[in-house]
């Protein structure tokens, strides 16, 4: 699985990585002005786990299981 993955929050992450086989999902999250793009585990694609792992109380997130599916426009749909 390929995901956009930037180590630190960035407005427009364009770094694509081949996720390790442990990861079966891509995540994009917006918390305030912070946008996170990550390789993720689908079992953690729920509000509680995303907020806990990102130390953010309010956010919007989108998980998907296709290559490079975690781009900004997904959060606007």
């Amino acid at each position: 699985l390929q995901c956009y993955n930037c180590p630190n929050p960035t407005a427009d992450c364009k770094t694509a990585v081949n996720c390790s086989s442990d990861f079966d999902a891509c995540l994009i999250t917006k918390a305030g002005l912070q946008v996170y793009n990550k390789c993720w585990k689908f079992e953690h694609c729920n509000f509680n786990d995303v907020t806990t792992r990102l130390r953010e109380n309010e956010l919007t997130y989108y998980c998907c299981k296709k290559d490079l599916c975690n781009f900004n426009e997904q959060l606007e749909n």
């Epitope: 180590p7 630190n8 770094t15 996720c19 442990d22 079992e43 953690h44 786990d49 792992r53």
Partner: antibody, heavy 121, light 107 residues
Framework: EVQLLESGGGLVQPGGSLRLSCAAS????????MSWVRQAPGKGLEWVSY????????HYPDTVKGRFTISRDNSKNTLYLQMNSLRAEDTAVYYC??????????????WGQGTLVTVSS | DIQMTQSPSSLSASVGDRVTITCRAS??????LAWYQQKPGKAPKLLVY???TLAEGVPSRFSGSGSGTDFTLTISSLQPEDFATYYC?????????FGQGTKLEIK
Amino acid sequence: EVQLLESGGGLVQPGGSLRLSCAASGFAFSSYDMSWVRQAPGKGLEWVSYISSGGGSTHYPDTVKGRFTISRDNSKNTLYLQMNSLRAEDTAVYYCARDGYYAEYYVMDYWGQGTLVTVSS
Amino acid sequence: DIQMTQSPSSLSASVGDRVTITCRASENIYSYLAWYQQKPGKAPKLLVYNAKTLAEGVPSRFSGSGSGTDFTLTISSLQPEDFATYYCQHHYGSPLTFGQGTKLEIK
């Protein structure tokens, strides 16, 4: 304050079994992945197991696969490591560690003080 | 499995020195690299993750850099409490592996 307290170590004969426990406090245990890492006397660090927050996924290196089983009881805030068919090379201090620092998987930000397992006849 | 190789295995330095420790991965791990410090008889302490992000409470004299396969941990001005063993660890995915460690000793 985050605290991880390991117990259950001791002397065991080759081929024997042991169950380690790690009691967690000071954080929402059920929301965090956890790992066990060991360190043989005078040697470096070796990761031995991982379990996701809900227990749905576990991972092991080949050196312990099939012999060690990681589990957790989120109602008791406790992590376990069941070790079977123990070998002399399993002798080490075993640390439990909280996994998942910020948005990262497999980064361990809090560690217990360790429990010593000695495998010897 | 991804192999992590640290160099040097040991290093003597003095208080105030600038010190660099190197870690090399056997394959591309992007920026998925962490550094830990361990003092004798103590548990490891997280210093850096994502190759260059300092963990909470870590002094700014520590810095990490690199991506892909080659990484460094730099201590800009050694303090007495920095004499310890340092380990790198990739966090790209399981199995997790550590470098063999670099023991930093007082000259």
